[in-house]
Amino acid sequence: EVEKTACPSGKKAREIDESLIFYKKWELEACVDAALLATQMDRVNAIPFTYEQLDVLKHKLDELYPQGYPESVIQHLGYLFLKMSPEDIRKWNVTSLETLKALLEVNKGHEMSPQVATLIDRFVKGRGQLDKDTLDTLTAFYPGYLCSLSPEELSSVPPSSIWAVRPQDLDTCDPRQLDVLYPKARLAFQNMNGSEYFVKIQSFLGGAPTEDLKALSQQNVSMDLATFMKLRTDAVLPLTVAEVQKLLGPHVEGLKAEERHRPVRDWILRQRQDDLDTLGLGLQG
C-alpha cells in the first residue's frame, strides 16, 4: 500500500498537461501536486479527463483548501464545477461577475441545478443586492430566474436593476412577486413619457393597483388582452365599464373570448347589465 501511494519514478507532474490522462487514479493522487493544480486550473478543461480522474483532482483541491476554494481557482473550475456539491459551494466567496459567468457557462442549456442555485445565492448575498449587471447576466442564462425568487428576495432588487428586465423574464411570476416588482418598475420608469412608459411598465402591470389602472385608462394606451388577463383581480373589480373600455381601446372586443376566465369573469359579474350592454359584446353579468 505504501509503495502504491508513492509516485513512481519519473512520473511526478511538472505541469498540468495531456500526459495526465494516461495516469491511473492513484497515480494522479500521488504525482500531481495540489498547489500546481490550483495554479494551472485553466488547463484542466482542455484535457479530456474521465469523471473518475476529475474526482481525484477535486479531492486534491478539497485537501488544499478545506475552508473553501479561493476565487482564483473557482474562476477556472470549468467542468470540474459539475463535480461540486451545494455544500462545497457554500464555503466559497464569489465576488467577481466574470467568475459567475464562467461557471454559469458550464451549466448552459440545462435546468438550474442545486449547485447553480447555491452559487447564485452566494453571489447575490455577497453583493448585498441584485444589481443591474448581475440581473442582466442571470436572466441571460435563466430567463425564469427573477420569478424563482421569493417576494422577500425580490425586495432587495434596486429600481435601477429593473431596466435589465425583459418581458419574458416575468412570464412565470405570480401576483405576489409582481406586487414587489411593480412599484420598483414604476419608480425606474417614472421619467419616461406616456407611450414609452406604457411599453416599459406593461410587463409589470400584474402588480398595479386600481388607481394606476384608472390613470392608464385616461392615456389611450390600448392595453392588449394578454396584459389585462394578468392584472390583479382586486385591482380590476372596481373599474367601471367605461374605464375598461378606455383601457383596452380596440382590444375591448377580446373580452368576449375571455368571459369565462378570471379576472374577466369576476369583473363582468360585478357590473350592471345596462353598462355591459353599451359594449355591444353580449356579455352577461
Partner: antibody, heavy 119, light 107 residues
Framework: QVQLQESGPGLVKPSETLSLTCTVS??????????WSWIRQPPGKGLEWIGY???????NYNPSLKSRVTISVDTSKNQFSLKLSSVTAADTAVYYC???????????WGQGTMVTVSS | DIQMTQSPSSLSASVGDRVTITCRAS??????VNWYQQKPGKAPKLLIY???SLQSGVPSRFSGSGSGTDFTLTISSLQPEDFATYYC?????????FGGGTKVEIK
C-alpha cells in the same frame, strides 16, 4: 366571523327534486367580493362543484349538471338555495355550501349535510 | 372543462417527512389553483390559494408553487395532524374543477 349552515331533507326519492338551503350568519350574502357555491361529495369519493350564485342573481353551473340545477338567492333572509331535479342514486352525497372569496377560494364551508336518494 | 389530475392518489409517510403532491391541469389555469385539506367527516379547509399564497392561520410548513399547468403542494415536515386527503382546485375557468384527491396515510 362568517358561518354557513346547510338545511334540508336527508332523504329524497328517485326522480324527485332535492332542495337545500344555506343560511349565512356573521356576514352578508350581498357582499361585493363573494360568490356562494354548492359542492358535493359522494360517499368515499372526491369533491364536485355544482355551481355558484352572486347576490345580483347571476349564476354559473357545472355543465354536467346544468340541465337539472337551479341556485337562487334571498338577500332579505341572507340565504341561498339549491334545487336539483330528477335525482337518482348517483346524487347521493354530502352537500356543502361554501363562500368563494374572489381573491382566494372556498375559504368558508358549511359542515355539510348528507342527502340520500332512495325509495 | 379543465381537468385536474392529481398524483399520487395516495401515499404513506412518516412524521417529519417532506411530502410533495402534484396537480396537472389539462390546459393552463394561470395561477388560479387552490389546495384544500379534508379530514374524515369534516368539511374541506383552504390551505393555499392563487397557487402559492398561504391562507391565514395555516402553518408555514405548507407551501404551494406552480403556474400554467403544473402545480405542487409541499408539506416540509409532516405533522400528526396532517394525515388527511388533499385536493387541488382550479378557478380560472368558470366551470370549477377539483383534482381526484391525494390521501396521506401514516407509514
Amino acid at each position: 366571523q362568517v358561518q354557513l349552515q346547510e338545511s334540508g331533507p336527508g332523504l329524497v326519492k328517485p326522480s324527485e327534486t332535492l332542495s337545500l338551503t344555506c343560511t349565512v350568519s356573521g356576514g352578508s350574502v350581498s357582499s361585493f367580493t363573494d360568490t356562494w357555491s354548492w359542492i358535493r361529495q359522494p360517499p368515499g369519493k372526491g369533491l364536485e362543484w355544482i355551481g355558484y350564485i352572486y347576490y345580483s342573481g347571476s349564476t354559473n353551473y357545472n355543465p354536467s349538471l346544468k340541465s337539472r340545477v337551479t341556485i337562487s338567492v334571498d338577500t332579505s333572509k341572507n340565504q341561498f338555495s339549491l334545487k336539483l331535479s330528477s335525482v337518482t342514486a348517483a346524487d347521493t352525497a354530502v352537500y356543502y355550501c361554501a363562500r368563494d372569496f374572489v381573491l382566494s377560494g372556498f375559504d368558508i364551508w358549511g359542515q355539510g349535510t348528507m342527502v340520500t336518494v332512495s325509495s | 372543462d379543465i381537468q385536474m389530475t392529481q398524483s399520487p392518489s395516495s401515499l404513506s409517510a412518516s412524521v417529519g417527512d417532506r411530502v410533495t403532491i402534484t396537480c396537472r391541469a389539462s390546459q393552463s389555469s394561470r395561477y388560479y389553483v387552490n389546495w384544500y385539506q379534508q379530514k374524515p367527516g369534516k368539511a374541506p379547509k383552504l390551505l393555499i390559494y392563487a397557487a402559492s399564497s398561504l391562507q391565514s392561520g395555516v402553518p408555514s410548513r405548507f407551501s404551494g408553487s406552480g403556474s400554467g399547468t403544473d402545480f405542487t403542494l409541499t408539506i416540509s415536515s409532516l405533522q400528526p395532524e396532517d394525515f388527511a386527503t388533499y385536493y387541488c382546485q382550479q378557478s380560472y375557468d368558470a366551470s370549477y374543477t377539483f383534482g381526484g384527491g391525494t390521501k396521506v396515510e401514516i407509514k
